[in-house]
């Protein structure tokens, strides 16, 4: 989905390259082609990253942290390409890299600033704690510190409780919001400004449904067009809350178009799925089916949560028997 890295051109022979944690990047450097090519890449003007001269690599004094992680584009050196291919970048690799290139004609020095970002796909969770209901937007690993914003019915809200834990190379962030007793829709946005990547979580509470035992219920779940892109891989999960925890009824993977159903009374309409409508039917309701039903549509860029509350009441026959 994302390019290897992207470059921002800034003056004075200096470029900024933005990479993602654990991915490979290219530090660009070019020169006027000539013979007797010597290439030295250094980090922070101190550590040897890669050396090439007399037609081959010379890595005897390479700093150990770069061992087996760097290479040049050997077939392109003669064409003036001194770029460095850099494997599995970490946050410790952030900083200034200097590329020295000497030829029979000239010496040039290029500087490349490497910035590394992390953005493991966030999640939006709905939790019950005693009598309270919470929405939690969380991201397990993110760097730099993201911007988190909440909206209620499309209006920004200032309450933004953020629980943050920092590890050696990234932050783990939870942003809980108490939504007890609310019928509003909520939206949480997490933005990584470095990677220019935004994730949105949206939560909608549908009106409660009252059904009789043995009837069937149809619960709607359609993605909001603003977020939904059918070309992007996503997953749809229907689950039911029981005793404060959710159990999965069924799920659908867009990549394989597989549907897995764990509850025999659950049904999905294939034709509707093809139209990106993930509404479901639950047949032959019984009293224990009362509760909250959650539809979760998730991709790398969004999570859409739809909550239905279903009340199953005894049918007349059942009531008269009692």
């Amino acid at each position: 989905i994302f390019p290897l890295a992207f470059f921002i051109y800034v003056p004075m022979n200096e470029q900024i390259v933005i990479g993602r944690l654990d991915e490979d990047i290219i530090l660009p450097s070019s020169f006027e082609r000539g013979s007797e090519v010597v290439i030295h890449w250094k980090y922070q003007d101190s550590y040897k990253v890669h050396s090439y001269y007399k037609g081959s690599d010379h890595l005897e004094s390479q700093d150990p942290r770069y061992a087996n992680r760097t290479s040049l584009f050997y077939n392109e050196i003669q064409n003036g390409n001194a770029s460095l291919f850099f494997r599995r970048v970490s946050l410790l690799d952030e900083g200034i890299y200097t590329c020295y290139v000497g030829t029979a004609i000239q010496v040039i020095t290029n500087k490349v600033v490497l910035k590394v970002g992390v953005f493991l796909t966030p999640v939006m969770k709905y939790e019950k704690r005693n009598t309270n209901s919470f929405l939690i937007c969380s991201v397990l690993s993110v760097y730099p510190r993201p911007i988190i914003t909440w909206k209620m019915d499309n209006t920004p809200i200032s309450e933004n409780n953020m629980e943050e834990t920092g590890s050696l190379d990234s932050f783990s962030i939870n942003s809980p919001l108490n939504i007890t007793g609310s019928n509003s829709s909520y939206e949480c946005t997490i933005e990584n400004s470095l990677l220019k990547q935004t994730w949105t979580g949206r939560w909608t509470m549908k009106d409660g449904l009252h059904k009789m035992q043995s009837e069937h219920v149809s619960l709607s779940c359609q993605p909001v067009n603003d977020y939904f892109s059918p070309n992007q891989d996503f997953k749809v999960t229907w689950s039911r809350m029981k005793s404060g925890t959710f159990s999965v009824l069924a799920y659908y993977l867009s990549s394989s178009q597989n549907t897995i159903i764990n509850e025999s009374r659950f049904s999905w309409n294939k034709e509707l799925i093809n139209q990106s409508d993930f509404s479901m039917n639950l047949m032959d309701l019984n009293l224990s089916d009362s509760g909250e039903y959650l539809c979760n549509i998730s991709s790398d860029e969004y999570t859409l949560l739809t909550i239905h509350t279903v009340h199953v009441e005894p049918s007349q026959e059942t009531a008269s028997h009692n």
């Epitope: 007797e36 010597v38 007399k54 037609g55 010379h58 000497g102 010496v107």
Partner: antibody, heavy 121, light 107 residues
Framework: QVQLVESGGGVVQPGRSLRLSCAAS????????IHWVRQAPGKGLEWVAV????????YYADSVRGRFTISRDNSKNTLSLQMNSLRVEDTAVYYC??????????????WGQGTLVTVSS | DIQMTQSPSTLSASVGDRVTITCRAS??????LAWYQQKPGKAPKLLIY???SLESGVPSRFSGSGSGTEFTLTISSLQPDDLATYYC?????????FGQGTKLEIK
């Protein structure tokens, strides 16, 4: 134009020390590796030492390793060769010479005029 | 260390002659060989690098060839100004070593 000017030569007794200097001009000093090469009177050329453009790498001929130290000051465009425990066989004209580039290539594109070091009791 | 052996040690030739100097390495040095000219009382001057590449500003009558262990410097038409001692030098690996020199005299 590129200029390398050696200084500091003279007569010194065996076992004593001497410091040679090389002043560079006409090019970006910090971009190039510099070597010392010597030539005993009436003899051939002998490579002595090299220091890379950034001072990160230094290499010496076996005959001087442990006695001679090469250094540079990029802010002053100067190269030095500190010669300790001098021997009679160190008597030579000492040339500083600029590498093609960083110091890694190992051949000598520009030479100074040389400074004579005589080790004699 | 890699030993470099030049031959002949001394060479006498006439103006206009084609002159060849040979340099042999004790082990393969690929093409990492340079040739220098040193006139009496002067510093050496680079003529050829990478066995056959002519340094900028050097007259085209000078040429180099060879690879591995056998190398030659050729002056296609000797000029009076070419009176000098010529040195080969390997830069394949530390320590860099020179041949003992070939003194070229004009008849």
């Amino acid at each position: 134009q590129v200029q390398l000017v050696e200084s500091g030569g003279g007569v010194v007794q065996p076992g004593r020390s001497l410091r040679l200097s090389c002043a560079a001009s006409g090019f970006t000093f910090s971009d190039y590796g510099i070597h010392w090469v010597r030539q005993a009177p009436g003899k051939g050329l002998e490579w002595v030492a090299v220091i890379w453009y950034d001072g990160s790498d230094k290499y010496y001929a076996d005959s001087v390793r442990g006695r001679f130290t090469i250094s540079r000051d990029n802010s002053k465009n100067t190269l030095s060769l500190q010669m300790n425990s001098l021997r009679v066989e160190d008597t030579a004209v000492y040339y500083c010479a600029r590498d093609r580039s960083s110091g890694a290539m190992g051949y000598f594109v520009y030479w100074g005029q040389g400074t004579l070091v005589t080790v004699s009791s | 260390d890699i030993q470099m052996t030049q031959s002949p040690s001394t060479l006498s030739a006439s103006v206009g002659d084609r002159v060849t100097i040979t340099c042999r390495a004790s082990q393969s040095i690929s093409s990492w060989l340079a040739w220098y000219q040193q006139k009496p009382g002067k510093a050496p001057k680079l003529l050829i690098y990478k066995a056959s590449s002519l340094e900028s500003g050097v007259p085209s009558r000078f040429s180099g060839s060879g690879s591995g262990t056998e190398f030659t410097l050729t002056i296609s038409s000797l000029q009076p100004d070419d009176l000098a001692t010529y040195y080969c030098q390997q830069y394949n690996s530390y320590s860099y070593t020179f041949g003992q020199g070939t003194k070229l005299e004009i008849k």
